[in-house]
Interface confidence: low
């Protein structure tokens, strides 16, 4: 039975086996086509989601589709129902929390009162001044909180208490990539992790431990990537994995926050990387213990310099490392998070690519998550 399952797939009507390598090869080998059903699926970037959250205290902004202008949401007459609508527009299904925060001196957008129409937020037509003088600070999910704060050092062994969102993504019980829990159903990782194996069946997620082999595996229902853009073959290195059953959150299993749309990190901003990847750039072996390291944002201009990536790093990517080299993600860390701590931890990057590991002029290159918020929200909405 185990050997059959490992090498063969059972087609229904009529019942017969096909070699497992024929799964997800683009050919309908089963009469009903079920061999092409549970495969990595692509999902287009989709329309602009008309709500977003700003790094200015997670304040809610709403798009006026007629003019293309964004407005900040006034707290006047804002209700729990409106909060739920806003979060549903971004694909969240959990219960949101919201509060009033005063309009600050750096507020650049007009502030308008919000109403609802056809399960979408709209601006109230006769919107007068925002009487409360307050904006809506909205949190769609409790995220980005860990039991333990890491110390600032080079590279050291990590505890799951510090990084409860880190998961191991495994194919046939072998660690392939890292990933981050975003909510009870969804894990964020890199699309290139699935280049070799596009069938969903054998992929599993392991959460809740800092040791590779020691925790139960979770079944995967769907793996979703963006449509491949041949003009930018390294772009769009992002994937979402939908779990078959929702996670139960605990001290060691928690979600990390998505970044804000305007999360522009300046060079030298401190960040963290974690993973079970190779411990030496020339091979070495996969680490059994989760490792963590502090790095920093490296300016894209520097990253694209003559002695570095020379233009290969696009606006949808970011670089991180340390100027003198020596601290970097490596093979096996792919898909894991590049993290920034403000009030909560945010996944600002996904371990994507680079040349060598830890070279001074070739730091790690990461998928810039803020560039894909619209896509993430559209995927979640489609799956609500």
């Amino acid at each position: 039975k185990v050997i059959l399952d490992k090498y063969y797939f059972l087609c229904g009507q009529p019942l017969h086996f096909i070699p497992r390598k024929q799964l997800c090869d683009g050919e309908l080998d089963c009469p009903l086509g079920e061999d092409e059903e549970h495969c990595v699926k692509s999902f287009p970037e989709g329309p602009a989601v008309a709500v977003r959250l700003s790094k200015d205290r997670s304040t809610l902004q709403v798009l006026d589709s007629a003019t293309g202008n964004w407005f900040s949401a006034c707290f006047d007459n804002f209700t729990e129902a409106l909060a739920e609508t806003a979060c549903r527009q971004m694909g969240y299904s959990s219960k949101p929390t919201f509060r009033a925060v005063e309009i600050g001196p750096d507020q650049d957008l007009d502030v308008v009162e919000i109403t609802e129409n056809s399960q979408e937020l709209r601006m109230r037509n006769s919107s007068g001044p925002c009487l409360s003088g307050s904006l809506v600070s909205l949190h769609c999910l409790a995220c980005g909180k860990s039991l333990k704060t890491p110390r600032v050092v080079g590279v050291e062994e990590a505890s799951v208490d510090s990084w409860p969102w880190q998961v191991s993504i495994q194919y046939d019980k072998q660690h392939v990539c890292g990933g981050s829990i975003l909510d009870p159903h969804w894990v964020l990782t890199a699309a290139h992790c699935f280049r070799k194996h596009t069938d969903v069946f054998n992929w599993k997620v392991r959460a809740g431990s800092d040791k590779l082999g020691s925790f139960p595996s979770l079944a995967v229902a769907k793996i979703i990537i963006i449509e491949f853009n041949p003009m930018y073959p390294k772009d769009n290195d992002i994937a979402l994995m939908k779990l078959q059953f929702p996670l139960t959150f605990s001290g060691t299993v928690r979600p990390i926050c998505l970044p804000f749309f305007d999360e522009e990190l300046t060079p030298a901003t401190p960040l963290w990387i974690i993973g079970w990847g190779f411990t030496k750039q020339n091979g070495g072996k996969m680490s059994d213990i989760l490792l963590q390291a502090s790095v920093q944002v490296i300016d894209s201009t520097r990253c694209n310099a003559d002695d570095a990536y020379q233009g290969e790093v696009t606006e949808k990517m970011m670089c991180a490392g340390i100027p003198e080299g020596g601290v970097d993600t490596c093979q096996g860390d792919s898909g894991g998070p590049l993290m920034y701590q403000s009030d909560q931890w945010h996944v600002v990057g996904i371990v994507s690519w680079g040349y060598g590991c830890g070279g001074p002029s070739t730091p790690g290159v990461y998928t810039k998550v803020s560039a894909y918020l619209n896509w993430i929200y559209n995927v979640w909405k489609a799956e609500l």
């Epitope: 041949p230 003009m231 930018y232 073959p233 750039q281 020339n282 201009t301 694209n304 310099a305 003559d306 002695d307 570095a308 990536y309 020379q310 233009g311 290969e312 696009t314 040349y355 060598g356 590991c357 070279g359």
Partner: antibody, heavy 116, light 107 residues
Framework: QVQLVQSGAEVKKPGASVKVSCKAS????????ISWVRQAPGQGLEWVGR????????NYAQKFQGRVTMTRDTSTSTVYMELSSLRSEDTAVYYC?????????WGQGTLVTVSS | DIQMTQSPSSLSASVGDRVTITCRAS??????LNWYQQKPGKAPKLLIY???SLQSGVPSRFSGSGSGTDFTLTISSLQPEDFATYYC?????????FGQGTKVEIK
């Protein structure tokens, strides 16, 4: 897929100069590092140099230093390689190739013949 | 400059054979090593980048391994369309260098 289209074949006399163009299409031109690689008849591949798409900065192989000049025109998404003081051993197919570390996109090649 | 030495310079093999080509760098280049295939009158085609990563669209019978100074390109089961010249190339240095090439001919 990025397309690189090169200018046509050239026949030059020794001592003359040649300027080969490489036009990119299918993406943001400023993202492309363009290398030039040549191949003499029956010989292997030889790297000539590279131009950084953002700064216009160049790296040249020691062998060609002083004889080669690479430039770019962002308005037409075109990169140029000019080789001066030509000699018969410069007879080769010259390729442009996109990428700083590896090249999945190459031009079709331009044959430069140096003959008196 | 970093020297790249490929061996053998040519080899004869039959369809279905396992073929191995090696490339040695004059100094450590980590995994900054690429393999290209070239057919007469055509531009080179990228097969393997960063020593072991298979370029999109390249058949899985091609594989690369190695790090530091010693690298290998393996064709697990030679196909008729694989008869060509293969080059290694280092990108560790800003100044690229190529191996001298290995011509794979029909036995």
């Amino acid at each position: 897929q990025v397309q690189l289209v090169q200018s046509g074949a050239e026949v030059k006399k020794p001592g003359a100069s040649v300027k080969v163009s490489c036009k990119a299409s299918g993406g943001t031109f400023s993202n492309y590092a363009i290398s030039w690689v040549r191949q003499a008849p029956g010989q292997g591949l030889e790297w000539v140099g590279r131009i950084n798409p953002n700064s216009g900065g160049t790296n040249y192989a020691q062998k060609f230093q002083g004889r080669v000049t690479m430039t770019r025109d962002t308005s037409t998404s075109t990169v140029y390689m000019e080789l001066s003081s030509l000699r018969s051993e410069d007879t080769a197919v010259y390729y442009c190739a996109r990428g700083r570390y590896s090249s999945s996109s190459w031009g079709q090649g331009t044959l430069v013949t140096v003959s008196s | 400059d970093i020297q790249m030495t490929q061996s053998p310079s040519s080899l004869s093999a039959s369809v279905g054979d396992r073929v191995t080509i090696t490339c040695r760098a004059s100094q450590s280049i980590n995994n900054y090593l690429n393999w290209y295939q070239q057919k007469p009158g055509k531009a080179p085609k990228l097969l393997i980048y960063a020593a072991s990563s298979l370029q999109s669209g390249v058949p899985s019978r091609f594989s690369g391994s190695g790090s530091g100074t010693d690298f290998t390109l393996t064709i697990s089961s030679l196909q008729p369309e694989d008869f060509a010249t293969y080059y290694c190339q280092q990108s560790y240095s800003t100044k690229w260098t190529f191996g001298q090439g290995t011509k794979v001919e029909i036995k």
